[in-house]
Interface confidence: medium
């Protein structure tokens, strides 16, 4: 994502909102130009702490952060719904409070990844998150920008709940993909992605092992496990929402 | 201008539990949100937790989570940070600070008010 070029004197203008701004969009929108921790109050949620990274693209909520393997990802259902992790490091947001700021709104979707050799790449998605009666399903609203799109996720249109070891949603009959790879994730059929599988720092000999790790598969390959990534999200206006 | 005062620091064994206070003078009512940031000798000052004034979201580092708790008494313009299961790692000079303004609350730029510090050592 394009990184800011002109900070701007920040959010003295927040308090013109006479309440806590919803997301980091609403707090780019009102001047803020500081990327960092940021308190926001999503409409009928309590408040809560975010990361905000404000860009050109106006302001985006970090979801997820992988970078060193600090923080143990292979977690069960209720830590995938409240977060987990630290703020400066590798966290997960918490699927309840994601769907609390993206509410019934479609929403952007960026996924940032980095490989061993200093390669990256930014995947851009229109989506849309249901809340936990849908198990927290990703919805593809729109097609794909870029070159990898259509094998990484489902088919526009196609709904993928979360799962996570001990909530089993995923789309095969004959498989737990959370048990057998490692994290939760919107698993399909185990095998597109997965980006909070286990971190290795060295590439691990045994494919079963490999399998567990962090991938996307259209990108570097089904067993090649990434150095970095970093999810984030940006809920459009609500005119957009289909 | 707002004053701010630790206490409770201390030396403490492996295990043990300190209770770090951080009073707020002059017009703390004017505060945004209070933090705790450590730093440790030969280190850069970290984030360790805070907590808004109004809206009371906490956040902790992942080192400190699930061991150090911070709470607000509005009444009695203080903050508190409770730690338990003291490690050596958490042997350090702990800072309170105050925002006074909405901002980013790990950046130590945004803090306009810190305290004088409080040594808190942990004997293995």
């Known amino acids: 994502l394009p990184e800011m070029a002109q900070p701007v004197d920040p959010a003295h203008n927040v308090s013109r909102l006479h309440r806590l701004p919803r997301d980091c969009q609403e707090l780019f929108q009102v001047g803020e130009r500081q990327s960092g921790l940021f308190e926001i109050q999503p409409q009928g949620s309590p408040p809560f702490l975010v990361n905000c990274k404000m860009t050109s693209d106006g302001g985006w909520t970090v979801i997820q952060r992988r970078h060193d393997g600090s923080v143990d990802f292979n977690r069960p259902w209720e830590a995938y719904k409240a977060g987990f992790g630290d703020p400066h490091g590798e966290f997960w947001l918490g699927l309840e409070k994601v769907h609390s700021i993206t509410g019934d709104r479609n929403s952007r979707l960026a996924v940032q990844l980095r490989d061993w050799d200093g390669n990256a790449e930014l995947l851009q998605f229109s989506v849309h998150l249901g809340g936990e009666d849908t198990a927290y399903s990703l919805q593809l609203t729109a097609p794909v920008a870029g070159q990898l799109g259509a094998t990484t996720v489902p088919p526009s249109g196609l709904s993928v709940p979360f799962s996570t070891w001990d909530q089993d949603h995923d789309l095969r009959r004959d498989k737990n993909c959370a048990k057998s790879l490692s994290g939760g994730w919107w698993f399909g059929t185990c095998s597109h992605s997965n980006l909070n599988g286990q971190y290795f720092r060295s590439i691990p000999q045994q494919r079963q092992k490999l399998k567990k790790g962090i991938f996307w598969k259209t990108w570097r390959g089904r067993y090649y496990p990434l150095q970095a990534t970093t999810m984030l999200i940006q809920p459009m206006a609500a005119e957009a929402a289909s | 201008e707002v004053q701010l005062v630790e206490s409770g620091g201390g030396l403490v064994q492996a295990g043990g539990s300190l209770r770090l206070s951080c009073a707020a003078s002059?017009?703390?009512?004017?505060?945004?949100?209070m933090g705790w940031f450590r730093q440790a000798p030969g280190k850069e000052r970290e984030f360790v937790t805070v907590?808004?004034?109004?809206?009371?979201?906490?956040y902790y580092a992942d080192s400190v989570k699930g061991r150090f708790t911070i709470s607000k008494d509005i009444a009695k313009n203080t903050v508190y940070l409770q730690m338990n299961s003291l490690k050596p790692d958490d042997m350090a000079v702990y800072y309170c600070?105050?925002?006074?303004?909405?901002?980013?609350?790990?950046?130590?730029?945004?803090?306009?008010?810190w305290g004088q510090g409080t040594q808190v050592t942990v004997s293995s």
């Open positions: 907590i808004t004034w109004s809206g009371g979201s906490t």
């Open positions: 002059g017009r703390p009512f004017s505060m945004y949100a």
């Open positions: 600070a105050a925002a006074r303004r909405y901002g980013n609350l790990y950046n130590t730029n945004n803090y306009d008010y």
